[in-house]
Amino acid sequence: AMHVAQPAVVLASSRGIASFVCEYASPGKATEVRVTVLRQADSQVTEVCAATYMMGNELTFLDDSICTGTSSGNQVNLTIQGLRAMDTGLYICKVELMYPPPYYLGIGNGTQIYVIDPEPCPDSD
Amino acid sequence: AMHVAQPAVVLASSRGIASFVCEYASPGKATEVRVTVLRQADSQVTEVCAATYMMGNELTFLDDSICTGTSSGNQVNLTIQGLRAMDTGLYICKVELMYPPPYYLGIGNGTQIYVIDPEPCPDSD
């Protein structure tokens, strides 16, 4: 399996935005890479977002995705937005080298993202 | 050494308040106990607050202390307030059985407290 590294802990900003780097030890030069972010909480794993990109190009997530990202070599800079306290959990980076063959798969140990809901601002009278 | 247990991670609220339980495996019933909270960051250890209490009585911190607490048996419920993002760090619970002799000392592994500064509220025009 391909090695994937990601930070152990990240704090979301008070605006509910969390960013982290997902780095993979590519055995060669892939031209097509797929990155998927999975969330694990209470032993349930759900897909948060996914993007396939051509090396040297930007990552393109779906328009309604809560993720954005950029790539540089074997590093992917991922940003997840719109997070609430209830979204606190382990976010796992999964990397697949799609082309050329052979196919490689790597799964990181996960980044624990902590999210704190902000206090509401007082009403302006 | 006496065993002291405390949670690995706690998130401060958006108001900068963090609470955690410090539990010590007492060899019996001490009548006088001292609890100290230490903060470790960048290999520097500083004392955050300390209180000596008689079993069955409330913990009394100094008036200007950022800590408050209650005790129940071998558990101390600690609250630290006024925390800012720069206060993020490892908060270590140290428990000393002061009386009767012999003296016992226990130091926990620390609670990583994460603090996120809130976004300022917009000015009301």
């Epitope: - | 019996g28 001490a30 009548t31």
Partner: antibody, heavy 118, light 107 residues
Framework: QVQLQESGPGLVKPSQTLSLTCAVS?????????WNWIRQPPGKGLEWIGY???????YYNPSLKSRITISRDTSKNQFSLKLSSVTAVDTAVYYC???????????WGQGTTVTVSS | DIQMTQSPSSLSASVGDRVTITCQAS??????VAWYQQKPGKAPKPLIY???YRYSGVPSRFSGSGSGTDFTFTISSLQPEDIATYFC?????????FGAGTKLELK
């Protein structure tokens, strides 16, 4: 490493006084802890008898209080049990043991058997 | 006095079995409960104190749990050297009291 060692007569006549001593090595009995006597009748459970504290304070099991005295000799680093007016029901293995105040017993002697019989 | 009702009074088990002993206090004793092992002709040895903490040098197969009035002692995988009598003990209130013991035998 603290060590406790009981000594005393193995046979006591009914109505007499049972006397046992516990010699402590490796820790000064006046420095800390509470120094206890516990007994175990043949084939039965454990019964706490009483203690003498590091400060000379005493507390005895109310069920035996009227017949017990626990004293100490700090110069010899030992403490003693006297149980008066014994009967057959006092036949037991007697242990000395150390604890923190109102604590569990972390160190025990090997025990000494006392038989009450005429 | 606080009564410590221990059960069962005797128990037969095989090597590798999970063994559970319970103790019920007649009133709330918090977490001030210890468990001892006693082999014939020997003094009791502390295994667990403060309900769930293993005494120094005690193997991890021994564990304890509970609080208030109900307490459990467990041997996760019985070994031949574990054959002994086990006692619970409350040290919340004087006079300190013990359970009647559980004699553990090999099947």
């Amino acid at each position: 490493q603290v060590q406790l060692q009981e000594s005393g007569p193995g046979l006591v006549k009914p109505s007499q006084t049972l006397s046992l001593t516990c010699a402590v090595s490796g820790y000064s009995i006046s420095s800390g802890y509470y120094w206890n006597w516990i007994r175990q009748p043949p084939g039965k459970g454990l019964e706490w008898i009483g203690y003498i504290g590091y400060d000379g304070s005493n507390y005895y099991n109310p069920s035996l209080k009227s017949r017990i005295t626990i004293s100490r000799d700090t110069s010899k680093n030992q403490f003693s049990l006297k149980l008066s007016s014994v009967t057959a029901v006092d036949t037991a293995v007697y242990y000395c043991a150390r604890n923190y105040y109102s604590g569990y017993f972390d160190s025990w002697g090997q025990g000494t058997t006392v038989t009450v019989s005429s | 006095d606080i009564q410590m009702t221990q059960s069962p009074s005797s128990l037969s088990a095989s090597v590798g079995d999970r063994v559970t002993i319970t103790c019920q206090a007649s009133q709330n004793v918090g977490t001030y409960v210890a468990w001892y092992q006693q082999k014939p002709g020997k003094a009791p040895k502390p295994l667990i104190y403060s309900t769930s903490y293993r005494y120094s040098g005690v193997p991890s197969r021994f564990s304890g749990s509970g609080s208030g009035t109900d307490f459990t002692f467990t041997i996760s995988s019985l070994q031949p050297e574990d054959i002994a009598t086990y006692f619970c003990h409350q040290y919340d209130t004087y006079p300190l009291t013990f359970g009647a013991g559980t004699k553990l035998e090999l099947k």
